[in-house]
Structures are given as C-alpha cells and as structure tokens.
C-alpha cells in the first residue's frame, strides 16, 4: 500500500514539476527590468528565452522574437538546450511511469518489469529536474553578472551633460517557477526510485529455501527474515520450493522492509 502511495505521489509531483518546467520555458519573464534605484520610466522591459517584450504604461505590449540563432549568446542557447532536454526527458519519464503505475494493469506485466520502469522513469525525472535547475541557475548567474556590469557602467563615464537610462535586469518570475518546478520533478523522481525498491519482487520473502543437511532433508521457511541484499534475491544455485499457491495480491501484501521507508 505504501509503495503504491509513494509511486502515485511521485508521479503526481513529477507531473506538476514537468508542467512547471514547460511553463517556465515558455514564459517571457525570465528577466525583468530592475526598478530599484532607476529613473521611473513609463516603459517596462522583460525578456524570455524566446522573445523580449516591452510593456508601456499605456497598456500597449510589444514582443519581438529572437529570430536569429547564431547571433544569440552561447549561454542563452545552453539554457534553452537544458530546458528542452529537461522537458523531453520529463515527458518520456511521464509516459514510462504511467505504464509502471501499480494501480494500472496492462496485460500480464511482471512486477519486475514495473519496478524497472519505475526506476527508469525515476531516473529520468531526476535528470529532468537537474536540467531545469541547471538551466535556470545558469541564466540567473548570467543576470547577476550583467547586473553588476551595468551597475558599474551607471557610475562611470557619466561626466558629460547627457545621461542615458541604463536598463538593468533582475530575476523574473520564470526563474522561480523553474527552480520550484525542477525541485518538484527531482523530488518526484526520488520518490519513484524509492517506490521501485518496494515494487521489486523479493522472492526470499515468500519462497521456501531448501537446506540440505547430511542424512536429513529438512526444509526451513524463514519468516520476516531476508538474506538478500539487492533489489531482487539472487536465487542462482538455490533450489526453490513454492510455499503454497498464492494469488498475486496475496504475494504483494507481504510486508517488505522497503514499504515503510
């Protein structure tokens, strides 16, 4: 039950996270005009990954796309790439995780297959979240660098009579959306990985292992004790006896050490 909840919650959290990453990538407000310590202008500038916009106080807003590819800063291209990779990985992860959900039955899919799919989607979500966080952080770093450079320019070279309004940019809403969304996707991925451990069939939990003593043939059935260490028991070179016919649900209802993580 706890495994299903963890997996389901991981899926939902990742879904919200990926939706947020998509939203952040599409948003125009990655950087916004810094209004502090600036002359009050009747124009407000803001920029996204794909276009820059100007909102006049009169209400008129004009946006212009970056129609050049080669003329854009390498850092901006890198941020775009990171965000797109994050979205693609996240989307594939979501697709995989839908089929991996314990509450959804697809034919006679083995639990081991579902566990592997859950792990795969979890890793994809983790990488997706890291890509988004990295992309947003690179952009934020770029903003901070440019901010201090333009601040330095504001207080130098102004010996003449004519003053120019230096437009400085600060963090836009998209950065915060991206950070939160990346974090959620990352958390969702970790939850999926945790759920995977509980999904993996640990056969020593409900199979009888035959130990052959000299002159005797005694079968032991260990209860809650587990000798295995991995996600699945290593049954190589062991003779396994089925400890009675059980339904799939009964087998899965046995408590596992991973159910309570």
């Amino acid at each position: 039950m706890a495994v299903t909840a963890c997996q389901g919650l991981g899926f939902v959290v990742s879904l919200i996270g990926i939706a947020g990453i998509i939203a952040a990538t599409c948003m125009d407000q990655w950087s916004t005009q810094d209004l502090y310590n600036n002359p009050v202008t009747a124009v407000f500038n803001y920029q996204g990954l794909w276009r820059s916009c100007v909102r006049e106080s009169s209400g008129f807003t004009e946006c212009r796309g970056y129609f050049t590819l080669l003329g854009l800063p390498a850092m901006l291209q890198a941020v775009r790439a990171l965000m797109i990779v994050g979205i693609v990985l996240g989307a594939i992860g979501l697709l995989v995780s839908i089929f991996a959900l314990k509450c959804i039955r697809i034919g006679s899919m083995e639990d081991s297959a579902k566990a592997n799919m859950t792990l795969t989607s979890g890793i994809m979500f983790i990488v997706s979240g890291l890509c988004a966080i990295a992309g947003v952080s690179v952009f934020a770093n770029m903003l901070v660098t440019n901010f201090w450079m333009s601040t330095a320019n504001m207080y130098t070279g102004m010996g003449g009579m004519v003053q120019t309004v230096q437009t400085r940019y600060t963090f836009g809403a998209a950065l915060f959306v991206g950070w939160v969304a990346g974090g959620l996707t990352l958390i969702g991925g970790v939850m999926m990985c945790i759920a995977c451990r509980g999904l993996a069939p640990e056969e020593t939990n409900y199979k009888a292992v035959s130990y052959h003593a000299s002159g005797h043939s005694v079968a032991y059935k260990p209860g809650g004790f587990k000798a295995s260490t991995g996600f699945g028991s290593n049954t190589k070179n062991k003779k396994i006896y089925d400890g009675g016919a059980r339904t799939e649900d009964e087998v899965q209802s046995y408590p596992s050490k991973h159910d309570y993580v």
Epitope: V43, N45, S57
Partner: antibody, heavy 117, light 113 residues
Framework: QVQLKESGPGLVAPSQSLSITCTVT????????VHWVRQPPGKGLEWLGV???????NYDSALMSRLSISKDRSKSQVFLKMTSLQTDDTAMYYC???????????WGQGTTLTVSS | DIVMTQSPSSLTVTTGEKVTMSCKSS????????????LTWYQQKPGQPPKLLIY???TRESGVPDRFTGSGSGTYFTLTISSVQAEDLAVYYC?????????FGTGTKLELK
C-alpha cells in the same frame, strides 16, 4: 467615437481647492490611461499627471504635493484635484487619452480655470 | 527632472518651403528593450487642443500628411515639414514619453512670412 470633455468651476479664489472632471466616451477607463495637461495663457504645455488603466498614478514632481488624480470607472470619469491654488495656476486644463508610445492621441477641448480674488 | 529644449523658438517661413525644427532632451529617450525612442511631436493651432503628429520619434499617426517626418535618436530629435502649407502654421511641441515627469518641450512657433 472617442471623446473627452472637461468640466470645472471656472473661477476659484486663491488658496482654495479645485476639482476638474473629465468625462470620457467611446473607450473604457479600464483599458486606457488618462493624462492631465495645462497651458497658462500664451505659454507652453505642462504635464500634470496621469492615471493609468490599472489605477496607478504618476505626477509632476513640482506639483505632487498639491495634486491628486482619481477615477470612477462606472461613470467613465477622471478627476483632478488640486489644493492651495495660486494665481499662476490660471490656465487651460486638458485631459488626454494615452496610446502607443505613451503618446496622447485624443484630447478634450479643455476647461479654463482662473484663480483670482 | 528631464528637460526638453526646442529650437528655434519661432520660425518664419513661406509656403512650399522645407522646414526643420529640433528637440533636445537632457536624458536619453531610447529604450533598448524595443529599440524605440519615446519622443512625441504635437501640433497646436490657436484656440485648439494639441494634435498628435508623430510618436516613437518617427511613427506618423494615421491621418497625418506624409510631409511631416520625425527623426533622431537618444537625445536629439528633429521634425521636418517637407513643403509647408498654410494649414501647418501652428506651435509644435515635442514631449518625452519615457521618463517621468513626461515633460513637454518649450515649443516652436511656425509663422508665415
């Protein structure tokens, strides 16, 4: 069509307060900003202040302490309130609508204000 | 505060003549975000409210004859009337639409010889 019409008291005694109303038709105050501009007799234009579509205001720094601009969206009216009037406040007062480039595309015909005892 | 200075204060012309008047601002009116200059030109005839001629320094308002041309960038702007007509005799004002307060220029009066 777009129209703006100012209405005011005409004559006000010094140190008194003033309220001028700008009634608009043909557009919504929720979508456009309205500016106030005055012109003393035989002189140039002087920008007083603005109330933007969202309700935020900006004023001329020299008159800020004496000026107040508000609006009533339901009545399509913008109000200019000015305190401590002096004789040099005698002017033609215009209201104007703001459009692209924050420029004023439509103006009212103006209302004359005379500050005299 | 931003100061807008227009020159000359008055111009005496004959019809058909080409006229150029200038407007200088104490601060740049150029916005890097959209590469536009926030300067507007108005025409005011006696007893009338001003009329919008040009915004964004060079964009002509609809209905304005193409003999009116605005140019310039940053702090220096000009309004050119390619061939003055009798109906163009008026006072011309420039206005800063970028930095508060949105000050007007001192005006240039166009008179007939």
């Amino acid at each position: 069509q777009v129209q703006l019409k100012e209405s005011g008291p005409g004559l006000v005694a010094p140190s008194q307060s003033l309220s001028i109303t700008c009634t608009v038709t043909g557009f919504s105050l929720s979508s456009y900003g309205v500016h106030w501009v005055r012109q003393p007799p035989g002189k140039g234009l002087e920008w007083l202040g603005v109330i933007w579509a969202g309700g935020s205001t900006n004023y001329d720094s020299a008159l800020m302490s004496r000026l107040s601009i508000s609006k009533d969206r339901s009545k399509s009216q913008v109000f200019l309130k000015m305190t401590s009037l002096q004789t040099d406040d005698t002017a033609m007062y215009y209201c104007a609508r703001s459009l692209y480039g924050n420029s004023f595309d439509h103006w009212g015909q103006g209302t004359t204000l005379t500050v005299s005892s | 505060d931003i100061v807008m200075t227009q020159s000359p204060s008055s111009l005496t012309v004959t019809t058909g003549e080409k006229v150029t008047m200038s407007c200088k601002s104490s601060q740049s009116l150029f916005n890097s975000g959209n590469q536009k200059n926030y300067l507007t030109w108005y025409q005011q005839k006696p007893g009338q409210p001003p009329k919008l001629l040009i915004y964004w320094a060079s964009t002509r308002e609809s209905g304005v004859p193409d003999r009116f041309t605005g140019s310039g960038s940053g702090t220096y702007f000009t309004l050119t009337i390619s061939s003055v007509q009798a109906e163009d005799l008026a006072v011309y004002y420039c206005q800063n639409n970028y930095i508060y307060p949105l000050a007007f220029g001192t005006g240039t009066k166009l008179e007939l010889k």
